[in-house]
Amino acid sequence: EVEKTACPSGKKAREIDESLIFYKKWELEACVDAALLATQMDRVNAIPFTYEQLDVLKHKLDELYPQGYPESVIQHLGYLFLKMSPEDIRKWNVTSLETLKALLEVNKGHEMSPQVATLIDRFVKGRGQLDKDTLDTLTAFYPGYLCSLSPEELSSVPPSSIWAVRPQDLDTCDPRQLDVLYPKARLAFQNMNGSEYFVKIQSFLGGAPTEDLKALSQQNVSMDLATFMKLRTDAVLPLTVAEVQKLLGPHVEGLKAEERHRPVRDWILRQRQDDLDTLGLGLQGGIPNGYLVLDLSMQEALS
């Protein structure tokens, strides 16, 4: 708290300008009118106020707007946004995408702070769903944003928004998240032709079921190994050697390097060794010729 002291003669601020950087904390408190500050918030960011000076300016706004700042002030907070607590932000009603962009710009290039996370949460909840423009904006500032959402939160993403998603936005998504996103992507891209469809759907395939992988194997897609390694193990296991060969095309040779890793390792264990041998890659560990798998869960073999 800054002590209430009278403003020295001739120091009363008539406008928010650069001369204020020479004011001490108590002078800012005494000589800057909160209403003037609120109407000239757009000027604050143009002036190099220190951490301590911003504290005083925030205090003045808090006194003027105890129930939360109006959006006209929020949009122009600039670096003052960094002084806000999540509790402050929860009092706000941010509806404009321009306001969101302006505040995200302040923290650009830095990790998502609790303030930013709260702001985004407030904004998205206010909109009711994560629409395309919002998703576009958020992933531009935070490529990992989508993967920070729970599967429940992702369920509110409309398929139309999927067009805004770039491959790098999904880098940190886990299988549970891709399970939610994949059907939306499939719906979003359903009217595209084969090769274009594959380019778009590729980064979502970690959520694809077996039947969709089988369908893709019929389309000469030449899936790369990096994508294959991200597929759900339970979706890969039922694929035949012929289907995997068609799915990977020329990339099938890469299976050898990955034979000890999932899902390749588990898939190999499910294939007949003579089928694996047809690939000519030297993959070992398949079911020996003449053996029959009766219990898939235990993989007991009888001669």
């Epitope: 650069e18 143009a46 190099p48 220190t50 670096y79 830095h110």
Partner: nanobody, 114 residues
Framework: VQLVESGGGLVQPGGSLRLSCAAS????????VAWYRQAPGEQREPVAA???????IYADSVKGRFTISRDNAKNTVYLQMNSLKPEDTAVYYC??????????WGQGTSVTVS
């Protein structure tokens, strides 16, 4: 954000120095910036500032002697100090934008006028 100040040193009264401050990213090209100084036992105080629009302002004690400028291409801010006095002795810092608001400072560069 990294701020690296340089150019300080020992100088005789009446002499000149040019301080430089380099920042990572494109921090200085888009933000208001300022030079500050801290004399031994004193609080850090602003000496010169440049708004994001390019206008400049100086503390009364350095007016007419110090000039702040910036090179956006090099992402560097300068402080040209002429007619130096013993009372200008201090550690000089530059800052602006995100790091200033977050209270992150560089190591500063020491100026001694003697």
């Amino acid at each position: 954000v990294q701020l690296v100040e340089s150019g300080g040193g020992l100088v005789q009264p009446g002499g000149s120095l040019r301080l430089s401050c380099a920042a990572s990213g494109s921090m200085f090209s888009i933000n208001a910036v300022a030079w500050y100084r801290q004399a031994p036992g004193e609080q850090r105080e602003p000496v010169a500032a440049m708004t994001s629009g390019g206008s400049t302002i100086y503390a009364d004690s350095v007016k007419g002697r110090f000039t702040i400028s910036r090179d956006n291409a090099k992402n560097t801010v300068y402080l040209q100090m002429n007619s130096l006095k013993p009372e200008d002795t201090a550690v000089y810092y530059c800052n602006g934008g995100w790091s200033l608001a977050m209270n992150y400072w560089g190591q500063g560069t020491s100026v001694t006028v003697s």
